[in-house]
């Protein structure tokens, strides 16, 4: 470090360290003056600052601090946006899988069905994304919705395919009759369990990490009081009008400035750490019907099993169906 | 049991070592995730010595500045002269979070609220009684696990293999037929929850 | 540990050229705005050129303005000072400075000073 400067009788050296912040010298005085206007940088005797100074001196202060704390927050900001992306889009992937999956199994196992399975699978696991992405739609309503679209194509094709499919007058009995006969036994319900609590825990998740984002960029924009300015610049720039071009703050006098700039943001504190424990008995809770990629790539095989249900029991159900369904499907007949 | 093409199937006995260990699943990039964001948990409690620590401080120098004038590093008027006859260090902190800090503040209140009432204990057993009708769930050991029921195979464990990461620019065909998969074959009344999720390639 | 080496000092006649190097390292160069400074003989420091890190933005005291030129390579770790036109008051120990996050506050780091005289 260079030797210590003798007394300046002018303000030189002052000027051209201003200069660094501010280009042109009108601000600076050209020797030292009382500065019985300063409201920050006190003098003791004469001083090289202006009240302008100050003025910049407190401006550069603040926009330091906003600087320092996004630099401080990069790290973070950088792992939460880039997991909140890749989760959101692998959760997409699985459904699209899983979508997929119960499509190749009906092309496979129920030819007859495709077309019309296919547009209900679609829908389904649609409504599925959607839920994920925060949309307020029912999970026990898109489980219903699939099998009670589902029950009238299965009835008309695979249980009785001589039946014309035409009018809509049997299909809605037809969807009446799949909740009140329990048609497929409890496949509906099971799934509704499974869907919900794997659906609820990953939205909440993927809510969680844009909430993390939020936190992080709240704080990373927030705007330092005036207060927080002048301590800042009593730390930082008031040595300069004394002349004193090399010394730095004391390391505790920093700790204190901060301590009081931050006493706001430090509050969060609380809530961060328990925000992070939280998440962390969360996921640590994601595994079996709590994992949405375990539950919705295994739908596939719950509804074949849920088909067959219906196949095994077609006998009395047809027959139940008849008598039920029956004024429906007179009018069809005629 | 669905059908599936004869390429895609594969013998219940190879499904043993038909996953790589070291795959990525969505499950431990979770976990993954939450080890790195503990390293943050102190974040903002440790702000302003990260702060001090980024912005120049008298480290090796003899002398340093408190706010008034040039003091001795290790003096007691290291840290307090600068703050005297200044406004009150006391005051700025009474004054409260700012509006927007609070605001997040609620936010994480809330949500911290949303995820413990969603927080399972771990190695709960999957509900039972989910039906009247005496449907249950298996459970099978370990975390990552999950349980296929063969009709009278017993418990064939399986590694949950959706290799999300190198799958994030993959899309699969709907001629795809589930790979790797054995079905589940629910007994009369029964029915095996998990299935395996297949080598998706 | 971060250290700065000035080198290129020395006696020039009036009007005459220097280039004055830096050579830094213990930190990442590229990313650090740097400054020189100087200190005439019995007299107190004077700023005299800044330069971001990227060398994209560069500033100067008025009375080196047209006359010296900040510069750096960052894949050398090296700023430079190259200083046209001398006079007699340009003679000083000029040091390199690491800027620190706070822009215009007190630099982090200094180098030992290399030493320039301008005489006839």
């Known amino acids: 470090q260079p030797p210590p400067p003798p007394p300046d009788a002018t303000c030189h050296q002052v000027r051209s360290f201003f200069q660094r912040l501010q280009p042109g010298l009108k601000w600076v005085p050209e020797t030292p003056v009382p500065g019985s206007d300063l409201q920050v940088c006190l003098p003791k005797g004469p001083t090289c600052c202006s009240r302008k100074m100050e003025e910049k001196y407190q401006l550069t202060a603040r926009l330091n601090m906003e600087q320092l704390l996004q630099s401080a927050s990069m790290e973070l900001k950088f792992l939460i946006i880039q997991n909140a992306a890749v989760f959101q889009e692998a959760f997409e992937i699985v459904v699209r899988h899983a979508k997929n999956y119960t499509n190749a199994m009906f092309k496979n196992n129920y030819p007859s069905l495709t077309p019309q399975a296919f547009e209900f699978v679609g829908e389904f696991f649609t409504d599925v994304s959607l839920y994920i992405l925060g949309s307020d739609i029912n999970v026990d309503d898109m489980v219903n919705e699939l099998f009670d679209s589902l029950f009238p194509v299965i009835y008309t094709q695979l249980m009785n395919p001589g039946l014309p499919d035409s009018a809509l007058d049997i299909n809605e009995c037809l969807r009446g009759a799949r909740r009140d006969l329990k048609v497929f036994g409890n496949f509906p319900k099971l799934i509704m369990t499974q869907v919900s609590k794997s659906l609820q825990v990953t939205r909440i998740f993927l809510q969680a990490l844009n909430l993390g984002i939020e936190v992080i960029n709240t704080t990373d924009h927030l705007k330092f009081s005036k207060d927080c300015g002048r301590m800042l610049t009593r730390m930082w720039y008031c040595s300069y009008c004394q002349g004193l071009m090399m010394v730095k703050p004391c390391g505790g006098y920093c700790n204190v400035v901060m301590q009081g700039c931050m006493a706001g943001v430090v509050e969060i504190d609380k809530y961060w750490r328990e925000y992070i424990l939280s998440l962390e008995e969360l996921v640590n809770g994601m595994y079996r019907i709590y994992d949405m990629e375990n539950v919705l790539l295994g739908l596939f095989s719950t509804i074949h099993d849920s088909i067959q249900y219906v196949q095994k029991n077609a006998g009395k159900l047809t027959t139940t169906i008849g008598k039920l369904c029956a004024h429906s499907q007179q009018r069809q007949y005629r | 049991s669905a059908y599936y093409p004869e390429d895609l199937f594969i013998d219940k006995k190879v499904l043993k070592v038909a996953h790589v260990e070291h795959e990525e699943t969505l499950s431990s990039r979770r976990r993954e995730l939450i080890q790195k964001l503990k390293s943050f948990i102190s974040f903002y409690s440790a702000l302003p010595g990260y702060i001090c620590s980024h912005s120049p401080v008298a480290e090796n120098d003899t002398l340093c500045w408190n706010g008034q004038e040039l003091v001795e590093r290790y003096s007691q008027k290291a840290a307090r002269n600068g703050m005297k006859n200044q406004f009150n260090l006391h005051e700025l902190k009474m004054k409260g979070p700012e509006p927007v800090v609070s605001q997040i503040i609620d936010k994480l209140k809330h949500i911290n609220q949303l995820l413990r009432t969603m927080s399972m204990p771990k190695g709960r057993v999957l509900d039972k009684n989910l039906d009247e009708e005496g449907f249950e769930s298996g459970d099978c050991g370990d975390d990552e696990d999950e349980c296929i029921g063969g009709s009278g195979d017993g418990m064939i464990k399986v590694k949950n293999q959706l290799r999300f990461l190198a799958e994030l620019a993959y899309d699969l065909d709907v001629d795809d037929a589930p790979g790797n998969s054995q079905q589940a074959t629910p007994k009369d009344n029964e029915i095996s929850t998990f299935h395996n999720l297949g080598n998706v390639h | 540990e971060v250290q700065l080496v000035e080198s290129g000092g020395g006696l020039v006649q009036p009007g005459g050229s220097l280039r004055l190097s830096c050579a830094a390292s213990?930190?990442?160069?590229?990313?650090?705005?740097m400054s020189w400074v100087r200190q005439a003989p019995g007299k107190g420091l004077e700023w005299v050129s800044a330069?971001?890190?990227?060398?994209?933005?560069?500033n100067y005291v008025d009375s080196v303005k047209g006359r010296f030129t900040v510069s750096r390579d960052n894949s050398k770790n090296t700023l430079y000072l190259q200083m046209n036109r001398l006079r007699a008051e340009d003679t000083a120990v000029y040091y390199c400075?690491?800027?620190?996050?706070?822009?215009?506050?007190?630099?982090?780091?200094w180098g030992q000073g290399t030493t320039v005289t301008v005489s006839s």
């Open positions: 213990g930190f990442t160069f590229s990313s650090s705005a």
């Open positions: 330069i971001s890190g990227s060398g994209g933005s560069t």
């Open positions: 400075a690491k800027e620190s996050m706070v822009r215009g506050g007190p630099f982090d780091y």
